[in-house]
């Protein structure tokens, strides 16, 4: 039977999505106990029937990976959780409409920072996602977001930063002092979706200038 208030058993049912890995999470309510079990269903916009997620039926953990089930970039999805307590009380709650394109957050890019004597090179590696193209290969963030670009900053001293940006993967900051430490930050930006990744940071030191020794 339904509890007086579903929030007694179940709270904060939501998607947490990063780089298109879509995880459904929830919290137990004040009357939830360790032996409360949770069953997960999902569906797409306008569909009548909820689909039970295999591997996420009568589980005790408070998360369920729905990445595969929510992999269509143009679709809107819902998920819902039904909690059943040891005493037989139940509660069901659903997520808001979920669009992975709209709601996914971007992780920091994978970057290699290379020290030279008077320059620092930064090579951004393509970011894979779980999304698959029609032929089965995995798409990168660059494949999905056509306006994606990288913003790079090099902190030279407390008052001066150098900036670079673009769609290419290799960048180099020139005109640096040898044998000096610099802090680089690299972010992914997607203007059309107002997305900005957390920064990748690298602390790098230019090489000593051996030509004078």
């Amino acid at each position: 039977h339904a509890p007086e208030d579903p929030s007694d058993l179940l709270q904060h049912v939501k998607f947490q999505s990063s780089n298109f890995e879509n995880i459904l999470t929830w919290d137990s309510g004040p009357e939830g106990t360790p032996d409360t079990v949770y069953s997960i269903e999902y569906k797409t916009y306008g569909e009548r029937d909820w689909v039970a997620k295999k591997g996420c039926q009568r589980i005790t953990r408070k998360s369920c990976n729905l990445t595969v089930e929510t992999g269509n970039l143009t679709e809107l999805y819902y998920a819902r959780v039904t909690a059943v307590s040891a005493g037989g009380r139940s509660a069901t709650k659903m997520t808001d409409r979920f669009s992975s394109l709209q709601h996914t957050t971007l992780k920091p890019p994978d970057v290699t920072c290379i020290s030279k004597v008077r320059s620092i090179q930064m090579i951004v590696h393509p970011t894979p996602t779980p999304i698959r193209a029609g032929d089965g290969h995995r798409l990168t963030l660059e494949d999905i977001f056509h306006d994606l670009f990288y913003h790079l900053e090099l902190q030279v001293n407390r008052t001066y930063q150098m900036h670079l940006g673009g769609k290419q993967r290799e960048y180099e900051f020139f005109g640096l002092t040898p044998d000096t430490e610099f802090l680089g930050t690299i972010m992914i930006c997607v203007p059309t979706w107002a997305k900005e990744s957390a920064p990748y940071m690298c602390r790098v030191k230019t090489l000593p200038d051996r030509t004078w020794t």
């Epitope: 579903p6 306008g46 269509n72 143009t74 819902r80 509660a91």
Partner: antibody
Framework: EVQLVESGGGLVQPGGSLRLSCAAS????????MNWVRQAPGKGLEWIGE????????TYNQKFKGRFTISVDQSKNTAYLQMNSLRAEDTAVYYC?????????WGQGTLVTVSS | DIVMTQSPDSLAVSLGERATINCKSS????????????LAWYQQKPGQPPKLLIY???SRESGVPDRFSGSGSGTDFTLTISSLQAEDVAVYYC?????????FGQGTKVEIK
Amino acid sequence: EVQLVESGGGLVQPGGSLRLSCAASGYSITAEYMNWVRQAPGKGLEWIGEINPSTGTTTYNQKFKGRFTISVDQSKNTAYLQMNSLRAEDTAVYYCARFDAYFDYWGQGTLVTVSS
Amino acid sequence: DIVMTQSPDSLAVSLGERATINCKSSQSLLYSSNQKNTLAWYQQKPGQPPKLLIYWASSRESGVPDRFSGSGSGTDFTLTISSLQAEDVAVYYCQQYYSYPFTFGQGTKVEIK
């Protein structure tokens, strides 16, 4: 069996307020979206807005935003439509209707008459 | 807002004959992710709430007689009652759920000739 029962309609003066209730039974209100739709006498249907009863997230028809507010009391399995600054043209039967796109279950409706 | 326009406004059909109601939307209702059309049809009898007949333009709601069928795509849709019965006398509405705000046609009244 899913049932929706509206209440709270009646006669109200222009400028007045009214709160309509929609009591759901046969399912947990938090398991599906809930909408409010109205129908003026002898006229067509007009969508007011929707709520996700689990999260409280609402979307309104811009025409009603600011004057009408949709809410839910999960513990009572009931949705509400708070209507403020009522005008004569708000006279209508008000329905609650379930689902997130089209509407599979409707209440019988409650009549709101705005008149001095 | 998407404007839904139904025709005709009213329709008189003999018992057992076919009734056809048209619904035109001001923009395409084709939903790219599943290539279905976001259109529903309802029946409303006097003093009653609307009843869902058809969704996704052509999917019949459970329990709805198979004399009711929906067709069309993009901006032009049709509800057909293949053999009109006395109990089908009602007003019929189309509704789009492609975008907010959800909007309805003005209704088509079906009567017995």
